[in-house]
Interface confidence: medium
């Protein structure tokens, strides 16, 4: 027999979702008497957050299910349930086991720009020049698809002068020039950048937007006949 069981369930699931099954064996007869009929119950849950009845166990099968909404991996990524198994269909001898329930990450946190406003200076004509690094915070699991940022220039780049990529380690957005900028044509660009995740949001979340004011610096160019 096993003293500790492990299982997992996605955060934010609806009540009724099955998590795992625990089993206790009893050598006594379970056909003609109740001596070998095992009844399961949850004796305690730790931590009791958001409250102490997050899970239920099927009395006869030992299947553990979610009974309340509010599983939040960012707050509690693992629960410890003390399970009691009692023979004689609940009236006999009792043994206890532990079930550790891991709460798996769902993309329930949107990346947020911090800060949301940037000013940058770029010399005209420079191609592939790093303009600005944009920083986001995301409470989902680091380096998971729910955490990795995807950046999109939503507006302000009429001439398709800029591109933005995600730094694989820092998760920052790296804004660079795709084409040379012309000070004489336009000495300031205001870009609007939106950030989402690689993984889709599991619920409707507000999308964070950053504003980047790019000042084009004049470079002394030779006269042209």
């Amino acid at each position: 027999t096993q003293d500790t069981f492990r299982g997992s369930v996605l955060e934010g699931v609806l009540p009724g979702t099955s998590v795992m099954q625990v089993t206790a064996t009893d050598e006594d007869d379970a056909i003609y008497t109740y001596n070998g009929v095992v009844a399961y119950s949850i004796h305690s849950q730790e931590p009791k957050d958001p409250h102490d009845l997050m899970f239920t166990i099927h009395r006869s099968t030992g299947t553990i299910s979610v009974i309340s909404s509010g599983l939040d991996r960012e707050k509690v990524p693992e629960y410890t349930l003390t399970i009691q198994a009692t023979d004689m269909d609940g009236d006999g001898s009792t043994t206890t086991a532990v079930a550790v329930v891991e709460i798996l990450d769902a993309n329930d946190n949107a990346p947020m720009f911090d800060p949301q406003k940037y000013e940058a200076h770029v010399p005209e004509n420079a191609v592939g020049h790093e303009v600005q690094r944009l920083t986001v915070t995301d409470l989902d699991a680091p380096n998971s698809p729910a955490w990795r940022a995807t950046y999109l220039i939503m507006g302000g780049d009429d001439g398709d002068h800029f591109t933005i990529t995600t730094h694989p380690e820092s998760n920052q957005g790296i804004l660079t020039t795709r084409k040379g900028l012309d000070f004489e044509a336009k000495n300031q660009h205001t870009l609007y950048v939106e950030v989402t995740n690689e993984a889709p949001f599991v619920l409707k979340l507000p999308t964070s937007t950053a504003t980047i004011v790019v000042h084009v610096e004049d470079v002394n160019e030779a006269p042209v006949f």
């Epitope: 096993q2 997992s8 957050d49 939040d72 990524p77 693992e78």
Partner: antibody, heavy 123, light 113 residues
């Protein structure tokens, strides 16, 4: 560089409470859980509890009624409070960072530790 | 709670020798879903904080010399130092993170002859 530094009172009278602060740098408390571990003089290590990135906690059930772990993400500080101290609570108290926030990171393993603060319970 | 038992409690070896120490768990630390053993090894030098050497029973932490190797599965685990150096003088602890509360073994003290 990831650093953790504990600061505590040093001496606590029996039956009184203990408050220790762990100040971290080089990483964010919104990205990594923090554990508290203690070590009585000349003895082994005992895990006290953990505070997760979202503020939830798991405690050692043997000490749960006396323990409280909280944090202030903006100040990069984690706080341990322990009530009703007795002489056998005399120990060096460490805060330690979990390897990661996710199970596949091996989050139960602790990759960075503070130097610890010595707490003596004596009248 | 899970009980972790380390042996021997102390041992003395000469520089260059191979050393093995044992850690036994009161129940299996192997999770069938991911086939991982929830066990870590730490080194604590005199007057210092513990340092993580191994996690997942056999994965060496970044920066740890390759003379340190963790092995084993289920309930029986071993830490091996292939060629001991003088700087390895320390107490070595195993720790399970399969179930709460996390628990440590009593430690193995490594002394240099």
């Amino acid at each position: 560089v990831q650093l953790l530094e504990e600061s505590g009172p040093g001496l606590v009278a029996p039956s009184q409470s203990l408050s220790i602060t762990c100040t971290v740098s080089g990483f964010s408390l919104t990205s990594y859980p923090i554990n508290w571990v203690r070590q009585p003089p000349g003895k082994g290590l005992e895990w006290l509890g953990v505070i997760w990135t979202g503020g939830g906690t798991n405690y050692n059930s043997a000490l749960k009624s006396r323990l409280s772990i909280t944090k202030d993400n903006s100040k990069s500080q984690v706080f341990l409070k322990m009530t009703s101290l007795q002489t056998d609570d005399t120990a060096r108290y460490y805060c330690a960072k979990s390897r990661g926030v996710y199970d596949f990171d091996g989050r139960g393993a602790m990759d960075y530790w503070g130097q610890g603060t010595t707490v003596t319970v004596s009248s | 709670e899970l009980v972790m038992t380390q042996s021997p409690s102390s041992l003395a070896v000469s520089v260059g020798e191979k050393v093995t120490m044992s850690c036994k768990s009161s129940q299996s630390l192997l999770y069938s879903s991911n086939q991982k053993n929830y066990l870590a090894w730490y080194q604590q030098k005199p007057g210092q904080s513990p340092k993580l050497l191994i996690y997942w029973a056999s994965t060496r932490e970044s920066g740890v010399p390759d003379r340190f190797t963790g092995s084993g599965s289920g309930t029986d685990f071993t830490l091996t130092i292939s060629s001991v150096k003088a700087e390895d003088l320390a107490v070595y602890y195993c720790q399970q993170y399969y179930s709460y509360p996390y628990t440590f073994g009593g430690g193995t003290k490594l002394e240099i002859k």
